[in-house]
């Protein structure tokens, strides 16, 4: 017999849930569906995720999201989790923005990130609602740089990035400093291959590096490489 | 080939100081920067500093950490360098090393600092215990 | 100061393939070397320069460094390959020389 009122609360239907939180009046929600539409688009060394939230939110408006990323390795093909190696713009945890770039990726390394999206029934169930997308990261490879010359004052200096890659860069940036002086360094910018560090103290190791810049940004730094100066007894013009 | 042989004392007491000694046989002493590296019983690598005689300059480098106990000298007529570590603890119980770098400092204008080690010595046991 | 983070521990069985990293800040720009170390001995040198081998050590061991990772890769993995691993730099701000905290490879 139908009882004559209203019971004060309800049993969820299957599939639907209140969570512990939730007040007894609240109608029955689930978890919401995957992100609707994800993107990766590669920047150099950086990678920025863009997605639209679920078209089922569950009725729920407490929805939250979690990113993770996976590499692969191309010569092998075995994949592991790269958290510990890459960097991102916020926490990659509880996140209600529906972006996020992802920084210090390596050079030839293909990589998986999926978007999870959870409200606050996703913990009474197994299963999860995501989207993944992929990206290959081809950022220039780090210039090769030699030391071509030398004199008491001056440091000519080479380098070399593989001929494919060469077109994508605009300008080379030479970053050198006195070893031992942190505090300043200089910059010299230029388009061929070569430089001339000039006005250099005698006798005196220089910390030098060289950085492709690219349309997308920077490209992978080289070393630091340490050149030396020739001291004034054994001078000559520039001799390596 | 060059080789290392090290040599000191294995039990100390506390406030004592470490003496340990290593002679290079073989090699040119003067082009490669010498250094020691010590182990604790089960923990890491743990670098103390460097040394290197050039013409008449001593250049030293040491870890921040033990800079204010810590001296690294050098023997150039008998191609050898010398650790010494003052007001030992229990904490500086370790497995001492010294050891060669794989370059020469600088050649031709390029350095390597920081380079890797390519010869150990034998290693020497310093505990310290009352 | 400049750290490097390893993780302490690697398990692989024989046969696969080992990788053990080291983290550090920009550490693509600075030049990596791997020491293996067996209970008892002096450590060995393995890798240096990121991925050059000395004369003696057999070429299932190499390196990689880019990004904020260096990674020692040990292909074909015997239990003889079972021993803490370390990595090493030049800290170029500081002037000093940094290990890593060392991984204990684990051969199941």
């Known amino acids: 017999l139908p009882s004559p009122e209203g019971a004060t609360s309800c049993e969820c239907e299957e599939g639907f849930f209140r969570a512990p939180q939730d007040p007894a009046s609240m109608p029955c929600t689930r978890p919401p569906s995957a992100p609707h539409y994800l993107t990766a688009v590669g920047m150099g060394a950086k990678v920025e995720l863009r997605w639209t939230p679920p078209q089922d939110s569950g009725g729920r408006e407490d929805i939250v999201y979690s990113v993770t990323c996976e590499q692969c390795w191309p010569e092998s093909g075995e994949c592991g989790p790269c958290e510990a190696s890459v960097r991102y713009s916020e926490p990659p945890h509880g996140l209600t923005r529906t972006s996020v770039t992802v920084s210090d990726l390596e050079p030839h390394m293909n990589y998986t990130f999926t978007v999870e999206a959870r409200n606050g029934v996703s913990g009474l169930v197994t299963s999860r609602s995501f989207r993944t997308a992929s990206v290959s990261i081809n950022q220039t490879e780090p210039p090769k740089v030699r030391l071509e010359g030398r004199s008491t004052t001056s440091l000519s200096v080479s380098w070399s990035i593989p001929p494919p890659q060469q077109s994508r860069v605009w300008k080379y940036e030479v970053t050198y400093r006195k070893k031992g002086d942190s505090n300043s360094y200089n910059v010299r910018r230029t388009e061929g291959f070569s430089v001339t560090l000039d006005d250099l103290a005698p006798d005196t190791t220089y910390l030098v590096q060289v950085q492709a810049l690219t349309q997308e940004g920077q490209g992978a730094g080289s070393k630091v490489h340490e050149f030396q100066t020739l001291s004034p007894e054994g001078s000559g013009n520039l001799a390596v | 080939q060059v080789q290392l042989q090290q040599w000191g004392a294995g039990l100390l007491k506390p406030s004592e100081t470490l003496s340990l000694t290593c002679a290079v046989y073989g090699g040119s002493f003067s082009d490669y920067y010498w250094s020691w590296i010590r182990q604790p019983p089960g923990k890491g690598l743990e670098w103390i500093g460097e040394v290197n005689h050039s013409g008449s300059i001593n250049y030293n480098n040491y870890n921040p950490s033990l800079k204010s106990r810590v001296t690294i000298s050098v023997d150039p007529s008998k191609n050898q360098f010398s650790l010494k570590l003052t007001s030992v603890t229990a904490a500086d119980t370790a497995v001492y090393y010294c050891?060669?770098?794989?370059?020469?400092?600088?050649?031709?204008?390029?350095?390597?600092?920081?380079?890797?080690?390519?010869?150990w010595g034998q290693g020497t046991m310093v505990t310290v215990a009352s | 100061s400049y750290v490097l983070t390893q993780p302490p521990s690697v398990s692989v069985a024989p046969g696969q393939t080992a990788r053990i990293t080291c983290g550090g800040n920009?550490?693509?720009?600075?030049?990596v070397h791997w020491y293996q170390q067996k209970p008892g001995q002096a450590p060995v040198l393995v890798v240096y320069d990121d991925s050059d081998r000395p004369s003696g050590i057999p070429e299932q061991f190499s390196g990689s460094n880019s990004g904020n990772t260096a990674t020692l890769t040990i292909s074909r993995v015997e239990a003889g390959d079972e021993a803490d691993y370390y990595c090493?730099?030049?800290?170029?701000?500081?002037?000093?020389?940094?290990f890593g905290g060392g991984t204990k490879l684990t051969v199941l």
């Open positions: 090493q730099v030049w800290d170029s701000s500081s002037d000093h020389l940094v």
């Open positions: 920009n550490i693509g720009s600075k030049n």
């Open positions: 050891a060669k770098p794989l370059r020469p400092h600088c050649t031709n204008g390029v350095c390597y600092s920081g380079d890797a080690f390519d010869i």
